[in-house]
Interface confidence: low
Amino acid sequence: DVERTTCPPEKEVHEIDESLIFYKKRELEACVDAALLAAQMDRVDAIPFTYEQLDVLKHKLDELYPQGYPESVIRHLGHLFLKMSPEDIRKWNVTSLETLKALLKVSKGHEMSAQVATLIDRVVVGRGQLDKDTVDTLTAFCPGCLCSLSPERLSSVPPSVIGAVRPQDLDTCGPRQLDVLYPKARLAFQNMSGSEYFVKIRPFLGGAPTEDVKALSQQNVSMDLATFMKLRREAVLPLTVAEVQKLLGPHVEGLKVEEQHSPVRDWILKQRQDDLDTLGLGLQGGIPNGYLILDLSVREALS
């Protein structure tokens, strides 16, 4: 903590300017008026403050705004944003995309994923939903940041906005997030022709149920292995060997490379070995011929 001292008269601060880089921490604490700092936040970024000096400036703002900074201050935080914790950011109410852009630019190249995720969350809350302008801003200034949102927040995305999402924006999305986004994408792209539909829906398929994957296998889509490997395990396990062969088309040979990895490994264990042999890939681990398959999960559910 910064010790409190009285400001020497010759050090009184009337403007936020370059002279402050020569102030020691305790001089900044004693001489900078928090209200003046808040009013002239836009100047802070042009001044090469040290991390220690930024700590003092943050402390000033925290004292002035214990309930959270107003957006007029947040917009001009600049590199002071690097000092903010997720707990600080949770107190904010942010509605302006200009504010979001400014802070996303600042965070670039710094390890701030938790802070950025919290900031985006506050923007979505502040704006009421994840609208097209917000998605456009995220895809332009923070590829992958869409996936930092919780499934609950993502549920506020209108299907009409899904078209603005690019494949690379979904790279870091987990199954629960794709579970939310997939039905929206299905709705958004439902009027497209088969091949065009597949191109659009492919990045979202990690959230697709078995019946939709089965339907795709009837459409000659030739799914690539990378997409197949991202499918939900639960969606892949019920597929027959014939369905997987039709789904992957010429890419079916890739199953050999992935045979030790989920979901391929789990799928192999559920297939009859003689069915697997029809692929001619030498996949091993299927159910030997002549064995009876009991679905114990059904029996347990009935007992």
């Epitope: 009337h14 403007e15 300017d17 370059e18 090469p48 403050f49 930024l54 590199h79 190249g109």
Partner: antibody, heavy 117, light 113 residues
Framework: EVQLVQSGAEVKKPGASVKVSCKAS????????MHWVRQAPGQGLEWMGN????????YYNERFMSRVTMTVDKSTSTAYMELSSLRSEDTAVYYC??????????WGPGTLVTVSS | DIVMTQSPDSLAVSLGERATINCKSS????????????LAWYQQKPGQSPKLLIY???TRESGVPDRFSGSGSGTDFTLTISSLQAEDVAVYYC?????????FGGGTKVEIK
């Protein structure tokens, strides 16, 4: 429009002092640092120091520390640079320049100071 | 003090051609907090005061033609004039505005070939 108007050319004898003025207009004088830079004939630029017109705080290049004094008159929005114990190698054009954020965004026309016996 | 070294001392370029001026600092000008490089470029035409072109190494001052661009980071910086015009004949200076005393490079004279 930002304008910096400097005082006229001076001829001084070695050992004397010179005081160059720089009158600012078109912006809030106390909001920006004023820097002083000099340029000897046919030579490059040399930063002498700067002054915060709001507080009067100044920072000098150590090369001039014992001989230079920078002051301001807020009432007339004028900055002054006084250089004492002049020698022939101080012959130069002296510029005032307003900061834009540590860089020098606006420059005065310069004042030629000639030191000659 | 931070020493600024410019190269070349002079440069003759045909009209419409590219001119490249280099500037090297003895210490990094990259501020680890802001990720800004505290380097400016100035143009001084014969008989005139210097004029600011670029600050933060690559930010063009308003009103400066976009044929002027700055690049570089840390200790190595470049000013590029993409298509030299007659009115670009001048001496160009780099300056570090990171640590006092703020220091300038020795200047590069750009002429028409």
């Amino acid at each position: 429009e930002v304008q910096l108007v400097q005082s006229g050319a001076e001829v001084k004898k070695p050992g004397a002092s010179v005081k160059v003025s720089c009158k600012a207009s078109g912006y809030t004088f106390t909001n920006y640092w004023m820097h002083w830079v000099r340029q000897a004939p046919g030579q490059g630029l040399e930063w002498m120091g700067n002054i915060n017109p709001s507080s009067g705080d100044s920072y000098y290049n150590e090369r001039f520390m014992s001989r230079v004094t920078m002051t301001v008159d807020k009432s007339t929005s004028t900055a002054y640079m006084e250089l004492s114990s002049l020698r022939s190698e101080d012959t130069a054009v002296y510029y005032c320049a307003r900061s834009g954020g540590l860089w020098l965004a606006f420059w005065g026309p310069g004042t030629l100071v000639t030191v000659s016996s | 003090d931070i020493v600024m070294t410019q190269s070349p001392d002079s440069l003759a370029v045909s009209l419409g051609e590219r001119a490249t001026i280099n500037c090297k600092s003895s210490q990094t000008l990259l501020n680890s907090v802001s990720q800004n490089n505290y380097l400016a470029w100035y143009q001084q035409k014969p008989g005139q005061s210097p004029k600011l072109l670029i600050y933060f190494a690559s930010t063009r001052e308003s009103g400066v033609p976009d044929r002027f661009s700055g690049s570089g980071s840390g200790t190595d910086f470049t000013l590029t004039i993409s298509s030299l015009q007659a009115e670009d004949v001048a001496v160009y200076y780099c300056q570090q505005h990171y640590r006092t005393p703020y220091t300038f490079g020795g200047g590069t004279k750009v002429e028409i070939k």
